[in-house]
């Protein structure tokens, strides 16, 4: 009765700020009636909490039940296969899911031109699920940094990189005209979190943006 089914081979989190998704791989030769039970353990409480008895997808959004992630010691999750009265052993995430596992992203990057400079403003993530007091800048209150990559179009795909310590930055274009494309990757100097490069944001610079001075 107990453990005739094979266990899910792998279970892991992919998480961004207040967007915490658990993923797992299916058991071999699963049937149409195979589903997956998901349970969660909060460090410090040490008892497993059943979250879903029968998920037929291979991922589960745990954001709503891990809202205190940024003020806790973290979580572990486990998944097992269920088929009728049969179930597998549990497969547990092999790392603690904590704030360190959250991939850092930016909400967006806004560009404008002023007197030959490209002025950039990094919008921080504002997820709907985040409690009102848990803003990105309150959770990561110090040492926020951003790597900036600039590409000129047309160009030979060479990049200029710079690191800034503020959400506002300026890029000198050295009098060049054309399209400039910018990407941003966030980091926190005091933490080990991975960062995701933003999607490219582009702006066109023409002669009209330069002020002539004698």
């Amino acid at each position: 009765h107990g453990t005739e089914l094979p266990s899910p081979p792998s279970v892991w989190f992919e998480a961004e700020f207040f967007h915490h998704i658990l993923h797992w791989t299916p058991i071999p030769n699963q049937s149409e009636s195979t589903c997956y039970e998901v349970a969660l353990l909060r460090y410090g409480i040490e008892s497993w909490n059943s979250i879903s008895n029968c998920s037929q997808t291979l991922s589960y959004d745990l954001t709503a039940v891990t809202l205190d992630l940024y003020h806790s010691n973290g979580y572990r999750a486990r998944v097992r296969a269920v088929d009728g009265s049969r179930h597998s052993n549990w497969t547990v995430t092999n790392t603690r899911f904590s704030v360190d596992e959250v991939t850092l992203t930016v909400g967006s990057v806004n560009l404008e031109i002023h007197n030959g400079f490209i002025l950039g403003k990094i919008q921080l993530p504002r997820p709907k699920m985040a409690p009102a007091n848990d803003t990105y800048e309150s959770i990561f209150s110090h040492f926020r940094e951003y790597e900036i990559a600039i590409r000129k179009v047309p160009g030979n795909f060479t990049f200029t990189h710079k690191k800034v310590k503020h959400e506002n930055f300026s890029l000198l274009t050295s009098g060049e005209v054309g399209e400039f494309c910018v990407q941003v990757k966030p980091s926190v100097a005091s933490r080990s979190n991975k960062g995701m490069w933003s999607k490219e944001e582009c702006i066109s610079l023409t002669r009209q943006y330069f002020t002539v001075t004698n």
């Epitope: 081979p9 792998s10 892991w12 993923h23 291979l58 991939t103 795909f157 990049f159």
Partner: nanobody, 124 residues
Amino acid sequence: QVQLQESGGGLVQAGGSLRLSCAASGRTFSSYGMGWFRQAPGKEREFVAAISWIGGSTYYADSVKGRFTLSSDNAKNRIALQMNSLKPEDTAVYYCAAKYYTDSYFAATSYAYWGQGTQVTVSS
């Protein structure tokens, strides 16, 4: 600028094999994983296979399980799809994609970067 470049498509007889490759270029390439989708004429784009960098695991559509094998390199910017025992119903344009969002590996909306596609034709 991130670009995905596919290669390896072509015409093959039913029962034959093909190997598709995909390389991501660009110093600002970030992804949770990479995968393949396909689109046959008049049909929706459908999931074929994907790999997760964090989980180190692969996913396959039921229709290709046991016939297709997805592999990747250690640098996490190149994948290959070995397609064996090909069937006429595998005929489609195959697209390489990079998973940019944390949601399901099976949903095209989780992928932000796409290649131009490579044609695979399986004749009976």
